[in-house]
């Protein structure tokens, strides 16, 4: 059998006066009791109605009643001021039963045909209530055949009486330092049969203050204290209330950080409730006085628990706790009314004594030893032998505590050695090898390490030499014994330098010609520049104009002399540059392989011979005077030549340095 509701048997039918449609007799009394199933009512209407009309229907009438209530007393054919005929009206029972009584008196002045009526049971819509009557349900009413049910809005639950909606108003916890809470639906009437609990729970150290605001309306009683609805306030110290009636309760200073508010309502009444605005206070901390040259933010009238302030220093002043710097400072007020950190100082920024400048000096401009904010210092390089690299040397103590140049640089200026200074101011005539005098070739470097070789000082920590001269030591740089500042090869008086690394041109192939015969040695320490130790300049772009054929260059070294021994004293020779084609042709004949002279080489010497560099001079510089700058520069590096030095028709071959400027600059900048 299919499941589902069991519908009641249908209730419907017809009623009529005795003898209908004929006239009814006198002295008739007839009663019908109609009953519908629970949850249903009866509907009745007349299709015919013709009864004797009398004042207030005293003689003949049809009376409709439901329970104890008379719904209508009907007579006549049409309604008058004092009598009612049914006309087209429909009549409804109040519950599930309807009584119909027909009565005729002892006489009729004329014949009356009585009535005919039809009835039927129909569902009662319990959700429809007459104006002024209490609604069936608190919130939502749902009608169905034979009955109804109630439901509630979100935040409410249906009471066990199945009609009232009780508010779900417990368990709310307020943790902010201030806020508002109110009875449910405020300012509309609060719900019935509800028990609400609100908690204010602040951090220890705070004290809650309650203010009742706007209006207060809670059901009361003239004699008994709040017997129906009431509001109570509980703290860990005491209970306040109960409160009811229409008077706003006074402010409550709870002196507690936790408060429980209870609101209980009964099943009746129509009252708007209450609203509380709560705030909190705490023991204030001492008012923060800003240190000199500082200010407090934010500025408040008072600072209580969890309030904080920060200190900001004026430009040029910094936060210090004693000697220790702080980037920022924020103090927080604690529950005992003390700050969690002591006040720092705003001290004038002190950049401290400026760093020493290698090969230079510093001068205090603002005042002797003044190193505070906006103080000015002036760096300068040791005159004659050093010059300052792209910097005017003026530094200011800035607010960040660093000495800063006019270009915003915080690093020290660089004192670069002046290059190409020599006691010789011009190239000499072509004459035999000469002994060098002090300061003639201050760039000259003596390299010992297996063999004797030479090099030229670049800057104050690099040596330019020939690749073949240091090839054997490329993996053991520390084996190189580097000497400078002396004329005598065997003198004990010299400046010692040691190699940190050897860089051989990647295009150089040992024992396969001398192309790319160039190397750089990085010294492990800077050397002090003076009149006997000065770097050689690298050629400018325009340098080739001083290195044309027949222009005079100067080679220097301790290499083999005409006697066949290494020179004891530094020697030099002035030699002209030889036409490149002429030099190439000179080395095309055996025993020299074709292509010995490349575009990376330049040749110098006399066709007649006798003036040349020789073994032991390898790696030394062939230098030229730049007449525009009046500085000497390296044009060539002693590389190779004929088996017999100074041989007629043969020339000394030198690495052409101008071809290697990018390589030299890259190595020096990278390392």
């Amino acid at each position: 059998t299919p499941l589902g509701p069991k519908w009641p048997e249908p209730v419907f039918g017809r009623l009529a006066s005795p003898g209908f449609p004929g006239e009814y007799a006198n002295d008739q009394e007839r009663r019908w009791t109609l009953t519908a199933p629970p949850g249903y009512r009866l509907r009745l209407y007349f299709t015919h109605f013709d009864l004797e009309l009398s004042h207030l229907c005293e003689y003949d009438f049809v009376k409709l009643s439901s329970g104890a209530k008379v719904l209508a007393t009907l007579c006549g054919q049409e309604s008058t001021d004092t009598e009612r005929a049914p006309g087209k009206d429909t009549f409804y029972s109040l519950g599930s039963s309807l009584d119909i009584t027909f009565r005729s008196d002892y006489s009729n002045e004329k014949p009356f045909t009585g009535f005919e009526a039809f009835y039927a049971a129909e569902d009662i819509d319990e959700c429809q209530v007459a104006p002024g009557e209490a609604p069936t349900c608190d919130h939502h009413c749902h009608n169905h055949l034979g009955g109804f049910y109630c439901s509630c809005r979100a935040g409410y639950v249906l009471h066990r009486n199945k009609r009232t909606c009780s508010a779900l108003c417990s368990g709310q916890v307020f943790t902010q330092r201030s806020g508002e809470l109110s009875s449910p639906e405020y300012p509309r009437p609060y719900p019935k049969l509800s028990s609400c609990t609100y908690s204010i729970s602040l951090e220890e150290g705070f004290s809650v203050i309650l203010d009742f605001v706007e209006s207060f309306d809670v059901e009361t009683h003239p004699e008994t204290l709040c017997p129906y609805d009431f509001l109570k306030i509980q703290t860990d110290r005491e209970e306040h209330g109960p409160f009811c009636g229409k008077t706003l309760p006074h402010r409550i200073e709870t002196k507690s950080n936790t408060v429980t508010i209870t609101f209980v309502t009964d099943e009746s009444g129509d009252h708007t409730g209450w609203k509380i605005h709560y705030t909190s206070t705490a023991q204030p901390c001492p008012y923060p006085m800003a240190p000199p040259n500082g200010h407090v933010s934010p500025v408040q009238a008072k600072y209580i628990l969890k309030d904080s302030f920060s200190i900001f220093c004026e430009t040029g002043y910094e936060l210090l706790q004693g000697h220790l710097p702080l980037k920022s400072f924020t103090a927080v007020c604690q529950k005992d009314g003390s700050w969690d950190r002591p006040m720092p100082a705003c001290s004038i920024v002190d950049c401290g004594p400026p760093d020493d400048l290698p090969s230079g000096r510093v001068e205090y401009i603002t005042g002797p030893g003044v190193t505070t904010y906006k103080a000015v210092i002036q760096y300068s390089c040791e005159e004659t032998f050093y010059t300052m690299k792209v910097n005017d040397g003026k530094y200011v103590c800035e607010a960040d505590g660093f000495w800063t140049s006019s270009k915003g640089e915080k690093s020290l200026p660089v004192c670069e050695p002046v290059c190409g200074l020599s006691a010789r101011t011009t190239g000499g005539q072509i004459y035999g090898g000469q002994k060098a005098k002090p300061g003639d070739f201050p760039w000259q470097v003596l390299i010992l390490g297996g063999t004797t070789a030479a090099g030229a000082l670049l800057y104050d920590n690099w040596v330019l030499t020939a690749a073949h001269a240091v090839y054997e030591q490329k993996h053991d740089a520390s084996a190189l014994d580097i000497r400078m500042g002396t004329l005598k090869r065997l003198s004990p008086h010299y400046t010692q330098a040691w190699s940190e690394a050897v860089f051989i041109h990647e295009g150089y192939t040992h024992d396969a010609g001398f192309d790319n015969d160039i190397a750089l040695i990085k010294l492990n320490n800077k050397v002090v520049i003076n009149s006997n130790i000065t770097p050689i300049c690298l050629p400018r772009k325009e340098a080739e104009s001083f290195m044309r054929t027949d222009d005079i260059g100067t080679a220097s070294g301790w290499g083999l002399t005409q006697r066949g021994f290494l020179a004891r004293n530094l020697m030099y020779v002035d030699i002209p540059i030889v036409d490149h084609q002429k030099c190439t042709a000179a080395y095309e004949k055996p025993p020299y392989p074709r292509g010995s002279v490349t575009a990376n080489m330049l040749c110098a010497g006399l066709e007649s011979g006798g003036k040349d560099s020789c073994r032991g001079d390898s790696g030394g510089a062939l230098v030229f005077l730049d007449s525009e700058t009046e500085r000497w520069f390296v044009g060539g590096i002693v590389s190779w030549g004929s088996m017999n030095c100074g041989e007629a028709g043969q020339y000394g071959v030198y690495t052409k340095v101008i071809n290697y400027i990018p390589w030299i600059e890259n190595i020096i900048s990278d390392f």
């Epitope: 706790q321 004693g322 000697h323 710097p325 702080l326 950190r341 505590g401 660093f402």
Partner: antibody
Framework: QVQLQESGPGLVKPSETLSLTCTVS?????????WNWIRQPPGKKLEWMGY???????SYNPSLKSRITISRDTSKNQFSLKLSSVTAADTAVYYC???????WGQGTLVTVSS | EIVMTQSPATLSVSPGERATLSCKAS??????VAWYQQKPGQSPRALIY???YRYSGIPARFSGSGSGTEFTLTISSLQSEDFAVYFC?????????FGGGTKVEIK
Amino acid sequence: QVQLQESGPGLVKPSETLSLTCTVSGYSITSDYAWNWIRQPPGKKLEWMGYISYSGRTSYNPSLKSRITISRDTSKNQFSLKLSSVTAADTAVYYCSRHYGDYWGQGTLVTVSS
Amino acid sequence: EIVMTQSPATLSVSPGERATLSCKASQNVGTNVAWYQQKPGQSPRALIYSASYRYSGIPARFSGSGSGTEFTLTISSLQSEDFAVYFCHQYQSNPLTFGGGTKVEIK
């Protein structure tokens, strides 16, 4: 959780340079504070060597000024100590710490000996 | 430099008793003083900064006081874990300096 950890060789030869690094986790060394190097020779009291601040400024103990360098590598959140020309008197447990000592490394013993 | 002198060098106290440690600065250091506890083989542990401010996590039995040149660290009721060496430290001026330490031992 702020943590500091010293690292570096435990043995250094006389006249060489002592190098130590302090790696900081849980806090950026550029955010705030001074970052110190402090040492404690065996059986002796603590000695402050110097600091590098959040901004990169340094302050050194005058007794060490000619030999000490404190630097930092912000990309690695590290600061370093270099002490040149060491002698046996530089043998100590070396600590790095923050500001006025709220956080310390566990310390590393450096012995100066040939 | 500012010299920090601690006294006594050794303090013998029974557990549960009060210990008072003194530190004197050779010059005015304001309240720029910190106190540390150090146990053998361990790095120092910060207790107090700015003379009287206790670091979070440090038990309330430790308290600091003083300003100018005289400072005190008080341990109200010594626990077994409190037996250690205690250092004071001034950070008022360069060079920052430490006291020689007070060893608190069990009586």
